[in-house]
Amino acid sequence: PQIFNKSNDGFTTTRSYGTVCPKDWEFYQARCFFLSTSESSWNESRDFCKGKGSTLAIVNTPEKLKFLQDITDAEKYFIGLIYHREEKRWRWINNSVFNGNVTNQNQNFNCATIGLTKTFDAASCDISYRRICEKNAK
């Protein structure tokens, strides 16, 4: 099937035949990613993504992390990673455990960003940052 760069239904081409993402979303491994230019708190970011039929990104493979870091324009972006203080462990918003390293940890930094460094960075949930949303490609 022919793949179009632009289409009238608000979807853009992807790197996979027959699979599309909405306009302004990036395709990677059967998922669509939206990197916002506006900023908000983590809570507002979660709601922002939910309003787009998506969730904050779950960056649970090195490949996915590299893909996103390559397109983040040296800005900080909230992702779907939160520190559960009572348990003292980081979890993705689907509740699965994150066993990797988070830098810049601080008792008031219970959310996480990517983009400015090559690592996951702890951040205040109340500070406004850009956000990365993720959903299934159609």
């Epitope: 983590w42 809570n43 979660r46 939910k50 969730t55 649970n60 939160i82 520190y83 559960h84 203080r85 009572e86 348990e87 979890r91 993705w92 918003i93 689907n94 509740n95 699965s96 455990v97 219970n110 949930c125």
Partner: antibody, heavy 124, light 111 residues
Framework: QSLEESGGGLVKPEGSLTLTCKAS?????????MCWVRQAPGKGLEWIAC????????TVYASWAKGRFTISKTSSTTVTLQMTSLTAADTATYLC?????????????????WGPGTLVTVSS | ALVMTQTPSSVSAAVGGTVTIKCQAS??????LAWYQQKPGQPPKLLMF???DLASGVPSRFKGSGSGTEYTLTISDLEPADAATYFC?????????????FGGGTEVVVK
């Protein structure tokens, strides 16, 4: 730390009932979500709803429970479950349970503390 | 909706023996699985979380394993006190309302 439920009993079909869960040994603070789970006689466990114990009071319901069940935090140590339009299928032991949460952003994990339950019987 | 299928519904073993209980999820739940023990007339008690982490005070005879959609609870060196019904539960959040799905339970009889 413990939980204790009260308010169960016999209720007629289409009737209403409010159950109360009282926490002892801890306060309903920002680390916890308080939930209700039910268990029909001789059957398995069925989750009903949870409420975030922190200031936001975020609630989440099982899809089948929306509309008929309302979970509320009524004090620093109590949570209630209001049930309406009850039918025989709602006959069960209703258990209060605590879940660990994050910092109030709507994500909870496993149930790490349970109450003994209160029996609700719906019959004419 | 996310469905947890637990097998068998009942299992019997002798004191000192081993029993294995399986829990299958209808989709990948990324190890967001807990196991509970419930004795007659008592509330459930947390045994295991994140598929393989023992809850506080639970003996190491209880072992959880698995990933993806398949999970197992193994109880070795069975004791009479292990006679109970065991439930699995997922706390995977896929963004839908139907969280906290439980398995149907497995009754363990210790002979």
């Amino acid at each position: 730390q413990s939980l204790e439920e009260s308010g169960g009993g016999l209720v007629k079909p289409e009737g209403s009932l409010t159950l109360t869960c009282k926490a002892s040994g801890f306060t309903l603070s920002s680390y916890y979500y308080m939930c209700w789970v039910r268990q029909a006689p001789g059957k398995g466990l069925e989750w009903i709803a949870c409420i975030y114990a922190g200031s936001s009071g975020t609630t989440v319901y099982a899809s089948w429970a929306k509309g008929r069940f309302t979970i509320s935090k009524t004090s620093s140590t109590t949570v209630t479950l209001q049930m309406t339009s009850l039918t025989a299928a709602d006959t069960a032991t209703y258990l209060c349970a605590r879940k660990l949460g994050d910092v109030g952003y709507g994500h909870t994990t496993y149930f790490n503390l349970w109450g003994p339950g209160t029996l609700v019987t719906v019959s004419s | 909706a996310l469905v947890m299928t637990q097998t068998p519904s009942s299992v019997s073993a002798a004191v000192g023996g081993t029993v294995t209980i399986k829990c299958q999820a209808s989709q990948n739940i990324y190890s967001t699985l807990a196991w509970y023990q419930q004795k007659p007339g008592q509330p459930p008690k947390l045994l295991m979380f994140d598929a393989s982490d023992l809850a506080s005070g639970v003996p190491s005879r209880f072992k959880g394993s698995g990933s993806g959609t398949e999970y197992t609870l193994t109880i070795s060196d069975l004791e009479p006190a292990d006679a109970a019904t065991y439930f699995c539960q997922t706390y995977y959040d896929s963004g839908s309302d139907d969280l906290n799905a439980f398995g149907g339970g497995t009754e363990v009889v210790v002979k």
